[in-house]
């Protein structure tokens, strides 16, 4: 607890010390007080730098004395031999005795009082800004007029803040301006404009003389700038040394002028207005700007629109511009939004083709279209090859939009058919030789298929069942087989209009037009077992001659069994009707003359007892495409004839070809168009 | 019409092996698919195998892998089924049958062979 | 190998019931199945192919249908020579399988 005065006295005082001592006091008085410290007597053995016995006087961390030896006062009129006068309010003492004493030793008496101080004069650091008052006890700060102390009761400034500019122009300078500003101030103006507006700062370098920097360039007088998370400055020194042109982009500004205690100069003045905020010219790629300007300004508001090719995606809609407009912050509104490269997406995959996944799907990239060949080509044209166009679309060139279609190739068997030995006198044969060998099991008979969703067989074949079975893509027809094929179920059966319909159709003599249509309720998958067979053409080229070749196939009736097991084959010429009118009819069901001839039939066979028989009805007599050798088209049908191993009838395809296209039209899906 | 004509009643020990043939006649074995099927006493019919022309292989039902071989002497059209390893519950009248058309199984059965297994 | 399951193993009826029995596939085998009758002594004799397709010779009395997975054989009117066993076969995938059989005996 401090205390106003007190008395020290060495260990045993009067009587002598002892030896080996070491004791401290510490001396506490009230803040605001110093310490008198003196010695009223000192009888310590004497040393060199008192290094014996001493008593030593410590302020914080300052010796303020060692004692040792005698003392006697000078002054008869005071018992004081030795005194400290310290402007704090502590003070540790500290005796020290070494092992020995050559004689007695009394030691010390001394006094401490608490003592006022000045604490305006006695210390080398002024507290005081401007006036320092002392009391006993303390001191206090005041000011000289128009200046106030500050809160830390030490600094007195000119109250120069507060001042809030909010005109679109306008004139600050520092106070007294142009006479000297005053010393130990903090300055604090406030531009505050409408948003929109940024402010922007002229000075003129002569309006500026400030206290210039110290050695290491701080400036010790300093005027700054602050506009939002922006500063300029700090600035001092004669002369502005600055930009004269301060273009602050913001609508609010602080300037701040820090004064210290010396060295005051006429200060300086400043011009301000309101500037419409600019907003960058921005450099967005693949965009052009309408309006183009040199300067865009506050409440500006610009077009940007994409170049072809690019689009603005924003969420999930597309656009090719959009607007933005320059704000108040001096940034364009929609600024996130980019010209992106137009992404036509993952092409649509096409029935029975393909497309390679593309690198890129953007704007300018190329993909390709192929068909599953050689089973499927391209029938549109266009070449399969598409690009990226800038509405987004895969475009071709020849087609547009539209995507390529992969139709059956026809005519074309994976195997050409060989004849290995002398239907009836045929030979053996793989469905690879006659892939669009259709086989119907009720009745047994045969049928060829002409695209993906259409069998051209007999009308015979189909009158009595209009619900038949199909298989494709097998040799024989065995159930293991036929099982392991592709069974082909019908929609809907067409038979022609100049069909006749009979009650009895065993006694049939007329099989003019005998020709029909299935309908497939699904597409037919092509490959190397499975391919149709082309149609003819409407053109002379062809019309059949007598002697022309052409192959027959089915799992009719052989010489050796009713039904073939395996396909068989046979290469026939093309007779004239004649041939096929002087035939005696096998098992005539009426009279030789009834039996009809017309020019929609074929007469073929005659030469080494090869011919169609029970069975292979509605088969294709497929003939070498007259203007394309590597196909066959459908020239005939298997119809009827008048002996087995002799000739053979066969519907003429050419005559119908009109009927087949109009008919395929009128019932096709819409997937099919 | 096509005849099948099977070898007669066999009578073997376990362990032994037995072939049964099976001679076509009214057509070509080159023109068929040979099955064999056969049936235990008081039992049901199991299907055992047949030659398969188009894939060139036989094939055998699971049940008789590794014990049973099927052959054809296609010059006197003739098929053969051995069993090997016979036990007990081989014993069985065993039918070589042509396989049938568009959806039908069985064309023509053979008389069956009866094979009894006994020690 | 596709197993075949018939139902019910036996099944006792007189002279006129209508007889149904079950052929369950282990998969689909599509209509890739027939129906054969047994007598004892004597090569079975087909009387359904392809689920539903009447051989030849056969009474009408007796039809087929299903595919897929499940089938049926109905005798619309039992006679007494239709007392026999009955299996199914399915020709789907060789190899080719039976049924183990449904016994029709008189009640």
């Known amino acids: 607890e401090p205390t106003m005065y007190g008395e020290i006295l060495s260990p045993n005082y009067p009587q002598a010390y002892p030896s080996e001592v070491e004791k401290s006091w510490d001396i506490e008085v009230p803040e605001g007080y110093g310490i008198h410290l003196y010695f009223t007597h000192l009888d310590i053995e004497l040393s060199e730098n008192c290094a014996y016995d001493s008593v030593q006087i410590i302020s914080g961390d300052t010796e303020e004395g060692r004692l040792c030896g005698q003392r006697s006062s000078n002054n008869p009129h005071s018992p004081i031999v030795e005194e400290f006068q310290v402007p704090y309010n502590k003070l540790q003492v500290i005796f020290k005795s070494d092992f020995s004493n050559e004689e007695r030793f009394t030691g010390f008496a001394a006094y401490y009082v608490a003592t006022d101080i000045n604490e305006c004069t006695d210390f080398v650091d002024v507290p005081c800004s401007h006036f320092c008052n002392n009391f006993i006890g303390g001191y206090f700060c005041s000011c000289p007029p128009e200046y106030f102390l500050h809160d830390d009761m030490k600094n007195c400034g000119v109250n120069c803040s507060g001042d809030v500019f909010t005109a679109l122009i306008g004139e600050i300078a520092s106070p007294n301006y142009p006479k000297p500003y005053p010393e130990n101030s903090r300055c604090e103006y406030q531009i505050r404009l409408e948003k929109g507006f940024q402010v922007v700062v002229t000075l003129r370098r002569e309006d500026f003389d400030v206290e210039a920097a110290d050695s290491a360039g701080n400036c010790l007088d300093s005027l700054v700038f602050v506009a939002g998370d922006r500063q300029f400055g700090p600035y001092c020194g004669h002369g502005f040394p600055g930009p004269l042109n301060i273009e602050t982009k913001s609508n609010a500004l602080d300037i701040i002028f820090q004064t210290d205690l010396t060295g005051q100069k006429k200060g300086w003045k400043l011009r301000y207005h309101g500037d419409p905020m600019p907003c960058p010219k921005e450099d967005t790629p693949n965009s052009v700007w309408e309006p183009a300007k040199a300067k865009y300004v506050f409440r500006d508001v610009v077009q940007i629109t994409c170049l072809d090719g690019f689009e603005v995606v924003e969420g999930r809609v597309g656009a090719t511009s959009f607007y933005s407009t320059c704000q108040s912050n001096g940034k364009w509104s929609n600024s996130k939004l980019k010209c992106q490269p137009v992404d036509c997406g993952i092409p649509e995959s096409i029935e029975n083709g393909k497309v390679e996944d593309p690198e890129s799907t953007l704007f300018g990239s190329v993909i390709r279209y192929t068909c599953e060949e050689p089973y499927y080509y391209m029938e549109n044209g266009g070449g399969g090859e598409y690009h990226c166009a800038g509405n987004g679309s895969w475009v071709n060139e020849v087609l547009g939009p539209e995507l390529p279609k992969c139709v059956p190739v026809c005519g074309v068997p994976r195997e050409p058919f060989e004849e290995k030995q002398r239907i009836i006198g045929g030979s053996d044969a793989d469905i690879k030789n006659f892939p669009w060998q259709v086989f119907f099991d009720n009745p047994w008979a045969g049928g060829a298929l002409i695209n993906e969703y259409w069998v051209l067989t007999a009308a015979h074949v189909v009158e009595g069942n209009r619900e038949p079975t199909m298989y494709v893509g097998s040799t024989s027809v065995q159930t293991s087989r036929l099982a392991k094929s592709k069974m082909l179920t019908p929609e809907h059966v067409f038979i022609h209009p100049g069909w006749k319909l009979l009650e009895v159709p065993e006694g049939r003599t007329n099989f003019d037009n005998d020709i029909a249509l299935v309908r497939l309720k699904d597409p037919v998958k092509m490959g190397p077992t499975v391919s149709p067979i082309c149609l003819p053409g409407t053109s002379s080229d062809y019309n059949l001659m007598d002697g022309d070749l052409g192959l027959i196939s089915g799992w009719g009736r052989t010489e050796k069994r009713d039904r073939a097991v395996r396909l068989k084959a046979a290469r026939l010429p093309v007779a004239p009707l004649r041939k096929c009118k002087e035939v005696k009819v096998e098992k005539p069901t009426a009279d030789a003359e009834a039996y009809v001839f017309t020019p929609n039939m074929i007469c073929a066979g005659g030469e080494k007892g090869m011919d169609s028989c029970k069975g292979d009805s509605g088969g294709a007599f497929a003939v070498q495409d007259p203007n394309d050798k590597t196909k066959f088209y459908a020239a005939g049908l298997v119809s009827w004839g008048p002996q087995c191993g002799t000739y053979g009838l066969y519907t003429r395809v050419k005559n119908y070809v009109d009927w087949i296209m109009k008919t395929m039209q009128e019932n096709s899906t819409p997937r099919e168009d | 019409q096509v005849q099948l004509v099977q070898s007669g009643a066999e009578v073997k020990k376990p362990g032994a092996s037995v072939k049964v043939s099976c001679k076509v006649s009214g057509d070509t074995l080159t023109e068929l698919s040979m099955h064999w099927v056969r049936q235990a006493p008081g039992k049901g019919l199991e299907w055992m195998g047949t030659?398969?022309?188009?894939?060139?292989?036989?094939i055998y039902a699971q049940k008789f892998q590794g014990r049973v071989t099927m052959t054809e002497d296609t010059s006197t059209d003739t098929a053969y089924m051995e069993l090997s390893y016979l036990r007990s519950e081989d014993t069985a009248v065993y039918y070589c049958?042509?396989?049938?058309?568009?959806?039908?199984?069985?064309?023509?059965w053979g008389q069956g062979t009866l094979v009894t297994v006994s020690s | 190998d596709i197993q075949m399951t018939q139902s019910p193993s036996t099944l006792s009826a007189s002279v006129g019931d209508r007889v149904t029995i079950t052929c369950r596939a282990s998969?689909?085998?599509?209509?890739?199945l027939a129906w054969y009758q047994q007598k004892p002594g004597k090569a079975p004799k087909l009387l359904i192919y392809?689920?539903?397709s009447l051989e030849s010779g056969v009474p009408s009395r007796f039809s087929g249908s299903g595919s897929g997975t499940e089938f049926t054989l109905t005798i619309s009117s039992l006679q007494p020579d239709d007392f026999a066993t009955y299996y199914c076969?399915?020709?789907?995938?060789?190899?080719?399988?039976f049924g183990q059989g449904t016994k029709v005996e008189i009640k």
């Open positions: 049958v042509t396989e049938g058309l568009a959806g039908i199984p069985f064309d023509s």
């Open positions: 998969q689909s085998i599509s209509s890739w």
């Open positions: 076969q399915q020709v789907n995938s060789l190899s080719w399988t």
């Open positions: 392809k689920a539903s």
């Open positions: 030659f398969d022309p188009e894939e060139g292989e036989t």
